[in-house]
Amino acid sequence: IWELKKDVYVVELDWYPDAPGEMVVLTCDTPEEDGITWTLDQSSEVLGSGKTLTIQVKEFGDAGQYTCHKGGEVLSHSLLLLHKKEDGIWSTDILKDQKEPKNKTFLRCEAKNYSGRFTCWWLTTISTDLTFSVKSSRGSSDPQGVTCGAATLSAERVRGDNKEYEYSVECQEDSACPAAEESLPIEVMVDAVHKLKYENYTSSFFIRDIIKPDPPKNLQLKPLKNSRQVEVSWEYPDTWSTPHSYFSLTFCVQVQGKSKREKKDRVFTDKTSATVICRKNASISVRAQDRYYSSSWSEWASVPCS
Amino acid sequence: RNLPVATPDPGMFPCLHHSQNLLRAVSNMLQKARQTLEFYPCTSEEIDHEDITKDKTSTVEACLPLELTKNESCLNSRETSFITNGSCLASRKTSFMMALCLSSIYEDLKMYQVEFKTMNAKLLMDPKRQIFLDQNMLAVIDELMQALNFNSETVPQKSSLEEPDFYKTKIKLCILLHAFRIRAVTIDRVMSYLNAS
């Protein structure tokens, strides 16, 4: 058993049918010595008396808010949560496996640049009685500071019969140098509590591996005289790291017909302009990627050919 | 239709072209190592990230773009002295800092070159003959060093008398390639920045 926060405790249980559970001793936070009784949650049934209460915690029915009283007055509370270990592996009931980029990906994180700021998000089908708390650091043995905000509900989607909820959090490394070569990964730890169930999820990454630039901005077309060709131009996104000559991007320019089945023409360039043939009803899209370290491509920025 | 990227004119800054080749070569070598050594811990998540140049060179600090020198988090610089004549210095106005930067890059390359050559000698003794260093990568390191053209003491190739542990050598190769790829990215950024300046 360990303390999650003041008066909230997590009991770790080896979870299998007929498991013996864990013996837990609760102590009433009071100078009083006698006349103390204990109850669980809203029930008025007295579970025991005395300054300490010994309970065998086996299932969720044994978890909850234990309260010690004296003469009708509440003295203190202890909330017991359960953390299930199923065959040597901690349970992952609360969050959905996003399966991207690989199986068992519960937390996904992205950064728009090398400033040390990043966003993480996760999915759940649970709508109520749910709380998250996020901590982060650079490295784990001698951790350096990363400050995270509060997790917020950022999107709701309907997936088949189920509603899916997306939560996200923004974090910022306290003293980040955009040009630094990372040798210690960023660690992100999310504590999730649903009713009386506690779970924790972690992710470990280098900022360089989670970079996803914003799409190029100011995408414009300039028709070339006496030709079906157009000059496409764009600019680096505002959120990208500067100077751009150091933090360079490479671009992919795509000409896509109205129908998804039509052949796509693609050109790769390090410049912020390209000459392409603009077909009727087609659209021109441009996306960006770090020129030297192949992390994710940005989303597409698009303009119609007409 | 995937069109290759046109190589920029290297005339103004000859090192840019070489540094791009270096990044390509080390990335290819790392990919090959990860595929060939699939039963070894060779992914970024599995290895320890060690920097063999740590406390010996200070490339990141010495090559910091001017715009980032205002960022206090970037100024954890270390005092290191370097030789300051090099053929990549296209203009006489080149600052002492730029000379320091390029000589730091040169020292990095020299250190990695020695490590890779020592390692290759060990890998050639492996009866499994599982993996060797790409000669192209070694050649590209050499070309960039020549383009930088710094006079510096030659570091003798390390030789070891004990029987090599091939498992450890292959893991060390992965560690080295990951670190060198990161340094090659920094070198490319620096060359691109200097080229634009």
Epitope: D14, W15, Y16, P17, D18, A19, E59, F60, K85, E86, D87, G88, I89, D93, K102, N103, K104, T125 | F39, P41, E46
Partner: antibody, heavy 115, light 112 residues
Framework: QVQLVQSGGGVVQPGRSLRLSCAAS????????MHWVRQAPGKGLEWVAF????????YYADSVKGRFTISRDNSKNTLYLQMKSLRAEDTAVYYC????????WGQGTMVTVSS | SYVLTQPPSVSGTPGQRVTISCSGG????????VKWYQQLPGTAPKLLIY???QRPSGVPDRFSGSKSGTSASLAITGVQAEDEADYYC????????????FGTGTKVTVLG
């Protein structure tokens, strides 16, 4: 006393369907994940499928994906395996089993797929 | 396809020490716990070892398990006639959990 009692096995023709049941008693069935494991005659153990305690997630072996469906009725304390498009290679003893460091197995039920 | 490899058979005379190996990889045994089962003819498997080296109550102490890196082993010190059975190791793969990964199985024969 934890008990898992299996039923529903038998002889079936290729291409036909069969449903296996596993009745649980002696524990809070709705709190635990459950597996199906099979063993072809003279062969080793092969995992077939898993279902979470609340039925929210199901996982299948590639060899049965799209043909077999694992389900549970927590109000009846029963686990099911619906097998469709049966093949000769599905012939095996099928076991249900609890998920956890200490597990309990059903007695097994024989499924024979033969024309 | 079995990812955990066991020897097809091992044998010993009563009182001898018999060991069965179970070889896997970094993503399974290297990252997860190992169990061992005993299966007597015509019966369901019985748990012998859980979490690499733990014995459930009721399992004789002549059975012991260990794990090192990407391999595990089961030892029977002082093998007895009633130990003649098939033995299976089981683990998980970090990418496909909760799918159970079973070893190929080992037939233990007690001679004499």
């Amino acid at each position: 006393q934890v008990q898992l009692v299996q039923s529903g096995g038998g002889v079936v023709q290729p291409g036909r369907s069969l449903r296996l049941s596993c009745a649980a008693s002696g524990f809070t069935f709705s709190s635990y994940g459950m597996h199906w494991v099979r063993q072809a005659p003279g062969k080793g153990l092969e995992w077939v499928a898993f279902i979470r305690y609340d039925g929210s997630n199901k996982y299948y072996a590639d060899s049965v994906k799209g043909r077999f469906t694992i389900s549970r009725d927590n109000s009846k304390n029963t686990l099911y395996l619906q097998m469709k498009s049966l093949r000769a290679e599905d012939t095996a003893v099928y076991y249900c089993k609890t998920h956890g460091s200490h597990d309990n197995w059903g007695q097994g039920t024989m499924v024979t797929v033969s024309s | 396809s079995y990812v955990l490899t066991q020897p097809p058979s091992v044998s010993g005379t009563p009182g001898q020490r018999v060991t069965i190996s179970c070889s896997g990889g970094r993503s399974n045994i290297g990252s997860n716990t190992v169990k061992w089962y005993q299966q007597l003819p015509g019966t369901a498997p019985k748990l012998l070892i859980y979490v690499n080296d733990q014995r459930p109550s009721g399992v004789p102490d002549r059975f012991s398990g260990s794990k090192s890196g990407t391999s595990a082993s089961l030892a029977i010190t002082g093998v007895q006639a009633e130990d003649e059975a098939d033995y299976y190791c089981q683990s998980y793969d970090r990418g496909t959990h909760p799918a159970l990964l079973f070893g190929t199985g080992t037939k233990v024969t007690v001679l004499g």
